[in-house]
């Protein structure tokens, strides 16, 4: 008595597909060791066909696969374009031979079957309509027409001329004629459901002069496509259920036992298990549509259904397509937080993953917005402008070849709590969605700026001070120019490690930027930010004005560009986890750090946060310390 | 809601045969997987074999102990599962009871099936 467990016979029919399941005990050894699929040889030998180590036969080449999926304790066997001689007896097993643990399973592939020379075969799917052509005679002109369907030696009306329609076809079937025809007449079966499957008859005239043809309606149950994704991945349902229902509402559901529970459909309903990481788009006038549902759980794994009908709701006898999706958990996706904290004024980091085979892709970062459909507008990208409303406060750190780069979003408001997904134009599968929960500030921010209005004067001398805690003592200060499409970071000197870490002076950590002169082009967003190697930390963003001299006038303080950020301080809201390559920016001989500007920099520091984002830099008129 | 009624069950010598039939309501018969259980005396329910299709490829289950003597078949235009049960020994007897659920994870086991019927008895005399 084998422990393995599986289907012990398969049938089916030339062309089609079959997908064997096999169930193995669940142990250790057994979910790592080889999984194979072999044939029986007369000689005894069981020849592999295809096996979990990679090996794949001539024969099954691009018609097999086999996929283990260790959290079941099963792996399935699909094989795709059957014919007669795939006929025969088979084992799926496990073991670095054929002669391990292993099942019996006999597969039989038959002909497409045939009818009656007078029989025409309707095949169609659920929720379609059939036209069955019934020929007759000329003298049976002016007589009864009829559809009736055999069960068993009976024959029951369908429909006839007088305008009989059996209840159970009660608004799906008409029958009519074409034209001027006046030896055919058509019955039009609409929204197919599998009990209309059968053998019909079609009869003009009574008696034995009655014309009669056999019609065999199959209705075909949407054969499920098999979908096999990786955990933390995404995947995407592509519907095309026909212009008939173009104008329908669509959705889709997943199937729980008896019932198909929508996750989301154009009506605007959604599940909220799917909040933050679903899309609906249609993608085009004849019905098409697709879903894509990120950040795939374990328990996403199951069957799905899309639909089309007015309610939005599954509805029999309307057109569906199937899926069944697996999850695997031996995922080449990383695990990234799905949840990031902040506080108000503050900021946060947010790692996302990517293929790190394709670093030259390019990088997005979205916010997923819950309209009817859910969409998610493109917020920064490594070649797309930061969004209007961003600006300052959002960008994107690229760090190619790590499989990873980092968005920082600072002067964070309670408006910024949502949905935000990682993608890139490569590797579809590699989305990740994050939530963002921004709570209000409850003490002062860990890095705080002076002068809180920073107004330079042209052809003056201007700096900067950024004061940070003793728990930053051993990361890298940076001071960067927040450009739309970076922020540029400048060479940096800090003060505060100079001193022994033990006799850390809480006031006296201060990482300075000096403009020496001051040109037009030094107005904008700075950002003060720590980080440990290339895994980025906080960040606080200050706006300096520049104006020109005006002689006798007093400063202006600039626009109310840094009020956004003033409202509350914030804590440490993540930590990240990914590398990146400093961009240096090239030194302009105007730039200069004088130590004793950092010694004299005033200490009455405003609470200030912001957001940036790092790219590379060609110059930059600004150099911090 | 599919309702599922066992017929078929009856007493008979060791070595002969039974076919047992589960008729299923329900316009949807086709999206059912249908199975065999039995319940021995004084003992727990077991599985006995499953039949599952999906378009017009057909998966058939059977419990090792009666490999080679039942074999489970279906008639979708009757809505009808039968269990046609061969060489019939002593220990088959039991109460046998039809299962249907849309979805199963692992054929043999019970509790992933939905709809039961009320079971029909089947004794096997030596």
């Known amino acids: 008595q084998s422990p393995i467990f599986g289907p012990q016979d398969v049938s089916s029919i030339e062309g089609n597909s079959v997908s064997i399941t096999c169930y193995y005990p669940d142990t250790s050894v057994n979910r790592h060791t080889r999984k194979y699929w072999c044939r029986q040889g007369a000689n005894g030998y069981c020849a592999t066909l295809i096996s979990s180590n990679g090996y794949l036969s001539k024969e099954y080449s691009g018609r097999a696969s086999l996929i283990n999926f260790p959290e079941n304790s099963t792996f399935v066997i699909n094989i795709a374009h059957l014919t007669q001689e795939d006929t025969g007896s088979y084992k799926c097993g496990l073991g670095t031979t054929n002669r391990g643990l292993f099942f019996d399973v006999s597969l039989e592939v038959s002909q497409v079957p045939e009818f009656p020379n007078d029989t025409h075969v309707y095949t169609k799917d659920i929720g379609r309509t059939v036209t069955i052509e019934c020929r007759f005679k000329e003298g049976n002109a002016h007589s009864k027409k009829s559809l009736c369907k055999k069960r068993g030696e009976a024959c029951e009306v369908v429909i006839d001329s007088t305008e009989y329609v059996d209840p159970s076809y009660k608004d799906r079937a008409i029958l009519f004629m074409k034209g001027t025809s006046r030896d055919i007449f058509y019955v039009n079966i609409s929204h197919l459901i599998p009990s209309d499957a059968g053998l019909y008859v079609c009869q003009a005239g009574e008696g034995p002069s009655a014309d009669k043809n056999n019609a065999d309606l199959q209705v075909l149950e949407p054969e499920p496509e098999l979908l096999y994704k990786d955990l933390r991945s995404s995947v995407t349902f592509e519907c095309d259920l026909g212009r008939e229902v173009a104008n329908d509402a669509k959705y889709l559901c997943r199937k729980n036992k008896e019932t198909c529970d929508v996750i989301i459909n154009t009506l605007g309903k959604r599940d909220p298990a799917f909040e933050g990481r679903i899309l609906l788009t249609p993608r085009d006038d004849n019905g098409r549509f697709s879903v894509l549902i990120t950040g795939l759980r374990k328990e996403d794994a199951g069957h799905y259904q899309c639909g089309a009908h007015s309610s939005g709701l599954p509805q029999e006898g309307w057109p569906v397509q199937a899926w069944q999706l697996f999850v695997n958990e031996e995922s080449t996706i990383p695990n990234s937080r799905s949840v990031v904290k902040g506080v108000t004024g503050g900021s946060v980091a947010i790692v996302c993953p990517y293929n790190p085979k394709e670093s030259s892709s390019l990088k997005y970062w979205c916010h997923w917005e819950a309209d009817e459909n859910g969409r998610c507008p493109v917020l920064v990208g490594t070649q797309a402008l930061v969004q209007e409303g961003y600006e300052g406060r959002l960008a994107l750190f690229d760090q190619p070849g790590s499989g990873a780069y980092t968005v920082i979003l600072n002067q964070l408001t309670t408006q910024d709590s949502g949905f935000y997904w990682c993608l890139t134009d490569g590797d579809s599968r590699w989305r990740t969605t994050i939530e963002l929960q921004v709570a209000e500030a409850t003490k002062k921010p860990d890095l705080e700026v002076t002068p809180q209005n920073a107004t330079a004067v042209i052809g003056e001398t201007f700096t900067i001070s950024c004061h940070y805690p003793c728990k930053f003592y051993s990361q890298e200060k940076y001071w960067c120019k927040w450009s739309n499409d970076g922020c540029h970071i400048l060479p940096s000197h800090d003060e505060g490690a100079r001193q022994s870490s033990v006799s850390c002076d809480q006031s006296s950590q201060i990482v300075s930027m000096t403009l020496n002169p001051v040109k037009k082009e030094d107005e904008g967003w700075y950002w003060c930010g720590v980080k440990e190697g290339q895994v980025y930390g906080e960040t606080t963003a200050i706006y300096v004005a520049v104006e020109e001299r005006t002689r006798g006038s007093p400063h202006i303080n600039p626009t109310d560009a840094n009020a956004r950020a003033k409202d509350a301080p914030e804590e440490e809201a993540m930590e990240s986890s990914v590398r990146e390559d400093e961009n240096k920016a090239n030194l302009d001989p105007r730039l200069f750090a004088d130590e004793r500007e950092i010694q004299n920099a005033g200490d009455q520091a405003q609470e200030n946060r912001a957001s940036g984002n790092a790219g590379s830099a060609g110059g930059q008129s600004g150099s911090s310390k | 809601q599919v309702q599922l009624v066992e017929s078929g069950g009856g007493l008979v010598q060791a070595g002969d045969s039974l076919r047992l039939s589960c008729a299923a309501s329900?316009?949807?018969?086709?999206?059912?997987?249908m199975g065999w259980f039995r319940q021995p005396p004084g003992k727990e329910r077991e599985f006995v074999a499953t039949?599952?299709?999906?378009?017009?490829?057909?998966?058939?289950y059977y419990a090792d102990s009666v490999k080679g003597r039942f074999t489970i078949s279906r008639d979708n235009a009757k809505n009808t599962v039968y269990l046609q049960m061969n060489s019939l020994k002593p220990e088959d007897t039991a109460v046998y009871y039809c299962?249907?659920?849309?979805?199963?994870?692992?054929?043999?086991?019970?509790?992933?099936?939905?709809?039961w019927g009320q079971g029909t008895q089947v004794t096997v005399s030596s």
């Open positions: 299962a249907a659920s849309t979805v199963v994870a692992d054929p043999r086991a019970p509790n992933e099936y939905d709809y």
């Open positions: 329900g316009r949807t018969f086709t999206t059912y997987v």
């Open positions: 039949i599952s299709w999906s378009g017009s490829t057909t998966y058939k």
